[in-house]
């Protein structure tokens, strides 16, 4: 609601104001009535039977102060002209309201020409004879406004031209938009402007411990002519460590926190944090618990995971399948990843070194989310140690690591990959390959072949190369062929048994 600042209140003055009447004593005059043992004062005039009335009542000089537009509230009664037989010709039922601005009080020097008419004041209800005699007078309330005012003060004047009027209340006030707290912003008491369409823009100030949020608009409101605040723009939010309680920002209670300026309340400190003091913006982690840079302050503090729970390394020739189970303690996080590292040791010398460059992983060995990986291209007769480390978002904040190791000895080369290169009615040309790292340890390759279905006899050919042509074979016959590498330490893993068929004599020409 608009705040009214009263400049003049006749009814409240108890007849003490001593307004000027002109002509003196013949027109307007002060009267007193007693109601409920209290004196009620009014200025009245009722010279309805005489024509040519021009009676003036002028207020005392009113200091304008900061007012720009004044509001004039009048409470008055007007008697019905029909109450006065024969007086209808000169009787009126209205009076006129005037004002004059001045920089000084003219005292008793009253000059009508200085006054400007505001309006003719007409009653909504007139008091008829029966009501008047029954003491049921009809009280009218009218309000007018004047502005903008520019001089130090002003007078109001009431001109009677032959009515029967009693003026019970004259209240002159101006309007202010009252001091206001809204959106955690304080808006000062502001004088309402004088022009109806205009709105005075007023900047607000954030209350203690409140701020304009980043990218937000500064709080502003508009003070209308009627003293009402309109069109709020922007707002303030309680800063980190404070929450909104009614129209203020109150420090978070111990054990609670708020990490940013927002509308949200303080939150209870999450798990694995120390009790916070009053006004905390975050809750410190317990010893051994951490927060990753990207973790919200509302998230519990966490710790690195324990080692992978169970790790197996299953050798398959020159391959190893590593399998493990997740850590028993995830550290309170779900962002666990695994890293696999490899170390190889030469049995003869006992010398060891990293083997990342010489082995091949089924998927990149760092940042694994699955719990298995296959490592191939392993060298035969070598000892391998595989380390699987579990990490999460806070592992980088500690120096210790959580890992488990598994060792495996590769006693055989990887089985050769065999291909049929060519064939005739009596021969088969076969080639094979093994991973380059293993080739240096191979002494010879042994090719074993026999007719399919004949389990009693087989033939063996040895060669240092990667191919062989098997001759003196029967036409149109299926042979079972296997290739095995021979090393200084013994036999390597055999290839799988392949079935190759010689050509039939009819098709030999093709």
């Amino acid at each position: 609601q608009g705040k009214e600042v009263v400049l003049l209140d006749f009814a409240a003055a108890g007849g003490e104001l001593g307004w000027l009447t002109h002509p003196y004593g013949k027109g307007w005059d002060l009267m007193q009535n007693i109601m409920n043992d209290m004196p009620i004062y009014m200025y009245s005039v009722c010279n309805v039977m005489s024509g040519d009335q021009d009676n003036w009542l002028r207020t005392n000089w009113v200091y304008r102060g900061e007012a720009e537009r004044i509001f004039i509230e009048l409470k008055f009664t007007v008697r019905d002209c029909n109450s006065f037989p024969g007086g209808a010709s000169s009787c009126k039922e209205t009076f006129n309201l005037y004002y004059a601005e001045s920089d000084l009080d003219y005292g008793t020097n009253f000059q009508k020409r200085l006054f400007t008419k505001i309006d003719t004041i007409a009653p909504d209800e007139i008091t008829v004879s029966s009501d008047f005699e029954a003491r049921h007078v009809k009280l009218n309330v009218e309000e007018r406004s004047v502005g903008p005012l520019t001089r130090k003060g002003f007078y109001l004047a009431f001109q009677d031209i032959g009515a029967c009027v009693a003026l019970l209340s004259v209240r002159v006030y101006y309007k202010k938009c009252p001091e206001l707290l809204q959106g955690l912003a304080h808006f000062p008491e502001t004088i309402a402007g004088s022009d109806a369409p205009s709105l005075a823009t007023v900047a607000g100030t954030c209350v203690d411990h409140a701020v304009v949020p980043p990218g937000g608009e500064e709080p502003r409101m508009h003070c209308a002519v009627d003293g009402e605040w309109l069109v709020p723009i922007g707002q303030c939010l309680c800063q980190a460590g404070y929450e909104k309680v009614e129209d203020a920002c109150q420090a978070c209670s111990p054990g609670f926190f708020k990490f940013e300026a927002s509308e949200s309340p303080c939150l209870e400190c999450p798990e694995h944090t120390l009790p916070s003091p009053e006004g905390a913006t975050s809750c410190e982690c317990e010893e051994g618990f951490f927060r990753a840079p990207q973790d919200p302050a509302s998230m519990p503090c966490t710790r690195p995971p324990s080692a992978p729970h169970y790790l197996t390394a299953v050798g398959m020739g020159a391959k190893v399948e590593l399998r493990w189970t997740p850590p028993q303690d995830s550290g309170g996080r779900e962002d666990i990843v695994y890293s696999v590292t490899c170390e190889q040791c030469w049995p003869e010398s006992g010398e060891c070194g990293p083997c990342e460059a010489s082995v091949r992983y089924s998927e990149p060995p760092h940042g694994l989310t699955r719990t298995s990986v296959t490592v191939s291209d392993l060298e035969p007769h070598m000892n391998y140690t595989f380390t699987v480390e579990a990490r999460n978002g806070v592992s980088g904040l500690v120096t210790s690591r959580s890992f488990r190791t598994a060792s495996v000895s590769i006693n055989q080369t990887e089985p050769p990959k065999v291909r049929l290169e060519g064939r005739s009615t009596t021969s088969l040309s076969v080639s094979w390959s093994i991973p380059p790292p293993q080739q240096s340890r191979v002494w010879k390759y042994e090719v074993t072949y026999r007719k399919k279905g004949d389990s009693n006899s087989y033939n063996v050919r040895r060669t240092e190369g990667f191919s062989v042509t098997l001759d003196d074979l029967a036409p149109d016959t299926t042979y079972l062929v296997q290739v095995q590498a021979l090393t200084q330490e013994g036999q390597g893993a055999g290839s799988k048994v392949h079935e190759f068929q010689t050509l039939s004599p009819e098709g030999s020409g093709n």
Epitope: E16, Y24, G25, D29, M49, S83, F84
Partner: antibody, heavy 120, light 110 residues
């Protein structure tokens, strides 16, 4: 207590002059309009004149207009009535009276009265 | 006219009620005031406005008005009420500022 004390009456020849005084006490004299009312022997009350609280405004009954002058000295809390060109019909008891509100009364405080006799 | 007319005299037995009237055009516009005057003393205000009594005036005195008439009523008249009574009103004709009635002599019998 609140009172008005009058002085200055007496016998005067027709055409003569007389000045009546009315000393106020017990109230803020400068806040009230003051009147003179007279009463011929055995007759009704007759309003004579009024002066505004600040002394700037006066009004007279037609019967005394131009002959009588009302004045006041607020610093002395005193009201005066200067009567010139007195006539036999001006013979009366003269009362000063306070208008309790406004210019026209009612008259809530009265002086004790002073007799003015105009006779040759 | 600006005259206020009153009956010259009225009498009442002690303890009885008596009404003194006042007639005049001004009374349509303005309330009457009533004054009591005992021989050799100044008038005393009894009633003003709608029906207001100054402090010290007994409540047996009351006033009323209707149209061009105003009335002073004494309910339960007492011997000490024997006096002259004057009505008074602002003058609505503009001829005078204020006018007094012709006065009424109240006699309390016995």
């Amino acid at each position: 207590q609140v009172q008005l004390v009058q002085s200055g009456g007496g016998l005067v020849q027709p055409g003569g002059s007389l000045r009546l005084s009315c000393a106020a006490s017990g109230f803020t004299f400068s806040s009230y309009a003051m009147h003179w009312v007279r009463q011929a022997p055995g007759k009704l009350l007759e309003w004579v004149t009024v002066i505004s609280p600040d002394g700037h405004n006066t009004y007279y009954a037609d019967s005394v207009k131009g002959r009588f002058t009302i004045s006041r000295d607020n610093s002395k809390n005193t009201l005066y009535l200067q009567m010139n060109s007195l006539r036999a019909e001006d013979t009366a008891v003269y009362y000063c009276a306070r208008a309790s509100v406004g210019a026209t009364g009612p008259f809530d405080i009265w002086g004790q009265g002073t007799l003015v006799t105009v006779s040759s | 006219s600006s005259e206020l007319t009153q009956p010259p005299s009225v009498s009442v037995a002690p303890g009885q009620t008596v009404t003194i009237t006042c007639q005049g055009d001004s009374l349509r516009s303005y309330y009457a005031s009533w004054y009591q005057q005992k021989p050799g003393t100044a008038p005393k205000l009894l009633i003003y406005g709608e029906n207001n009594r100054p402090s010290g005036v007994p409540d047996r005195f009351s006033g009323s008005s209707s149209g061009t008439s105003a009335s002073l009523t004494i309910t339960g008249a007492q011997a000490e009420d024997e006096a002259d009574y004057y009505c008074n009103s602002r003058d609505s004709s503009g001829t005078h500022l204020t006018v007094f009635g012709l006065g009424t002599k109240l006699t309390v019998l016995g």
